[in-house]
Interface confidence: low
Amino acid sequence: MVRLPLQCVLWGCLLTAVHPEPPTACREKQYLINSQCCSLCQPGQKLVSDCTEFTETECLPCGESEFLDTWNRETHCHQHKYCDPNLGLRVQQKGTSETDTICTCEEGWHCTSEACESCVLHRSCSPGFGVKQIATGVSDTICEPCPVGFFSNVSSAFEKCHPWTSCETKDLVVQQAGTNKTDVVCGPQDRLRALVVIPIIFGILFAILLVLVFIKKVAKKPTNKAPHPKQEPQEINFPDDLPGSNTAAPVQETLHGCQPVTQEDGKESRISVQERQ
């Protein structure tokens, strides 16, 4: 063991006074006590008594459910962490004399910290929000507001935002626009069909009428070779009040691009709140 006076002789007292050094430089896995270096206790053991000039450091193994995870001079071992099942915790890895017990959360819960001292119930995403990332044992559910064209009408820890129903693919029309919390409401396209069919029918009738007029003209042709009298173009009048005439197709007013997405009060980001065990 190197004593302080010896160091003073070796390095020079003046040098020590100008550049104060530790009384002695102990090696790795040693500690300084009473101006001498003693061995640290190895992991899994605690210190019973410091070394002296004549004796080595005395160490004792940690007891059941205790541990020390470093080379140390601790006089007491640490208690293994207790994974309290009443608090939603369970043992992920049993502790040894050199390692602590690692706790994790029961199914449906996640740790709030790396140390996993607490568990929180996986957060549910409120209506208007969908699950972006499902919770794991160490991370909470990540929610995101449903963008325009998507909705969520439930509070869920698993459901993503669903796309609005496409009425067109079902040969239906949008009767009520969707929001971030509600789907669009589709309905039969009676009005639309009428708007399309009626002009077609009248178009056909008009064509038939033209053909009839043409046939009539041909039938009236004189048989002699006299020059044709100059014919005035025949004016065909359609009454203005015919259904479908002069009727503009209705503009389907949609809120695409301007759906209000409102962050619900109290949602983080509880938090919910979240339930936490």
Partner: antibody, heavy 118, light 110 residues
């Protein structure tokens, strides 16, 4: 406006069961943990227990067999099974603001006074 | 359950002065500590959470700090309206939400 209000506090004789009600407005009990705290006249605050958003209840060790917390969609009840004179206090209901920190309550009711006397 | 030992039980300060209130946790509570202010006839009001975060609407003269298991509330530049009783509330961030209040510190403004 988010608020909580306690009711049901009155003068009771020892042993007569009593239920206090905390009515919440402006937020949902399915999103927050709620706590009950009491304060005896001239004394400090004492934590009784909580009810989680899922409806799980947790009590202080001393309160376990004496109090029961339950809830509906808009109310949280605290039942005192068999009040003693030591239960004379103002009872507060409070919302736990963040689920990851059990100590932090942002909204408190004004309290309701329970007097137990023969 | 955790035990919170709050000191002093009462203190006084002049307007503009500084007040320090301490809370010692019987074991590690990982910064799960809040400070509350209570005036007579009123419910407690949250001042500090997570040991050092200032609650919404609370003046910046209130601050909190932590050193191991000792937590401190400091009021710098005390105002007359700060006369109240202050409580710490510590607890485990666990499912049981088990918490304990300190005994309280009554602050008198001279």
């Amino acid at each position: 406006c988010q608020s909580v209000e306690e009711s049901g506090g009155r003068l009771v004789t020892p042993g007569t069961p009593l239920t206090l009600t905390c009515t919440v407005s402006g937020f949902s009990l399915s999103d927050y943990v709620m706590r009950w705290v009491r304060q005896a006249p001239g004394k400090g605050l004492e934590w009784i227990g909580v009810i989680s958003s899922a409806g799980n209840t947790y009590y202080a060790t001393w309160a376990k067999d004496r109090f029961t917390i339950s809830k509906t969609s808009t109310t949280v009840d605290l039942r005192i099974a068999s009040p003693t004179t030591e239960d004379t206090a103002t009872y507060f209901c409070a919302r736990i603001w963040r689920p990851d920190d059990p100590t932090n309550s942002d909204i408190w009711g004004p309290g309701t006074l329970v007097t137990v006397s023969s | 359950d955790v035990v919170m030992t709050q000191t002093p039980s009462s203190t006084s300060a002049a307007v503009g002065g500084t007040v320090t209130i301490k809370c010692q946790a019987s074991e590690s509570i990982s910064s799960s500590l809040a400070w509350y202010q209570q005036k007579p006839g009123q419910p407690p009001k949250l001042l500090i959470y997570y040991a050092s975060d200032l609650a919404s609407g609370v003046p910046s003269r209130f601050s909190g700090s932590r050193s191991g298991t000792e937590y401190t509330l400091t009021i710098s530049g005390v105002q007359r309206e700060d006369a109240a009783t202050y409580y710490c509330l510590g607890g485990y961030a666990t499912a049981a939400y088990r918490t304990a209040f300190g005994g309280g510190t009554e602050l008198e403004i001279l």
